[in-house]
């Protein structure tokens, strides 16, 4: 269960790794307790959601992430099943790790 | 800035239903997980549920049967609801906005007391 | 459900000292543990999140350590603004709150 941010250390592009690819995460329902799961994941505290972030390429792994904001990991989430998504690159989500 | 406030009534009869608003500024309810919190009189706080995401609902196990969250996002507001209220009931009655479980900002109270 | 025991329940101390709450968990919590100060008429404050971040607006003498099932909050130079309740906090499962440590000035 590996994820990285694309952009920056701790803000840019959030993307996860999934069937030996990377793919990025589309916007849909995403809010700060998904960002933050996902940052926790990364060894931050807390996270910031950032919508359309976009710039990402390939597959488009996980749409409308519904995190309690207490889980240990994102596959631990409410989701669409891996790469069953209505959306495009420009609505991939972003974050913002502290 | 950040504000949330607790508003209903003050004294509640035993057996009856008690209804709460929470109402917020400054944040979007669905950036956010809105929980309840309650402290009876000289106790200690005790969580009572979460409203959070897609309108999902979170509820502390031992009230779950009494209780019920919602939320109108348009009203930036969210309602509780607990219906067979005993004077065990009676606390102080906190709102306060959850991020990744940590209670980062809180209403000042309403004191509720179920009485006859 | 997860129980949280805080030690001491009061703590009385004086303008200076170092002071050293406990909490402890019956099982492993992670690091999601959180600190919250409440004075007398008021609503609590976010102190300490996630086992050691300081919230923003907090000052420097309040901090936070601990894993697994040990925790403490540490105050390193006691203020007369001190004087609170202080509850421990988890969220790795279920939530629930210590049953607090009053601190008083001696």
């Known amino acids: 269960q590996r994820v990285r941010i694309m952009g920056g250390t701790n803000r840019g592009r959030a993307e996860v790794y999934y069937n030996n690819e990377w793919g990025t995460i589309c916007d849909d329902d995403w809010d700060n307790n998904d960002a933050t799961v996902f940052c926790r994941m990364l060894g931050y505290s807390r996270g910031r959601a950032l919508s359309s972030y976009g710039g990402g390429s390939g597959n488009i792994w996980l749409d409308n992430v519904n995190c309690r904001g207490t889980e240990n990991s994102l596959w631990d989430c409410s989701k669409n099943s891996w790469g069953n998504h209505n959306c495009v690159h420009n609505e991939d989500a972003g974050v913002e790790c502290s | 800035q950040v504000q949330l406030k607790e508003s209903g009534p003050g004294l509640v009869q035993p057996s009856q239903t008690l209804s709460l608003t929470c109402t917020v500024s400054?944040?979007?309810?669905?950036?956010?997980?809105l929980s309840w919190v309650r402290q009876p009189p000289g106790k200690g706080l005790e969580w009572i549920g979460a409203i959070w995401g897609g309108d999902n609902t979170d509820y502390n196990s031992a009230l779950k049967s009494r209780l019920s969250i919602s939320r109108d996002t348009s009203k930036s507001q969210v309602l509780l609801k607990m219906n067979s209220l005993q004077t065990e009931d009676t606390a102080i009655y906190f709102c306060?906005?959850?991020?990744?479980?940590?209670?980062?900002?809180w209403g000042q109270g309403v004191m509720v007391t179920v009485s006859s | 459900d997860i129980q949280m025991t805080q030690s001491p329940p009061v703590l009385s101390a004086s303008v200076g000292d170092r002071v050293t709450l406990s909490c402890k968990t019956s099982q492993n919590i992670n690091k999601k543990l959180d600190w919250y100060q409440q004075k007398h008429g008021e609503a609590p404050k976010l102190l300490i999140y996630?086992?050691?971040n300081l919230q923003t607006g907090i000052p420097s003498r309040f901090s936070g350590s601990g894993s697994g099932t040990d925790f403490t909050l540490t105050i390193s130079t006691l203020q007369p603004e001190d004087v609170a309740t202080y509850y421990c906090y988890q969220y790795d499962s279920g939530f629930t709150f210590g049953a607090g440590t009053k601190l008083e000035l001696k």
């Open positions: 400054g944040f979007s309810l669905t950036s956010y997980t």
């Open positions: 996630y086992t050691n």
């Open positions: 306060t906005r959850e991020l990744g479980g940590s209670f980062d900002y």
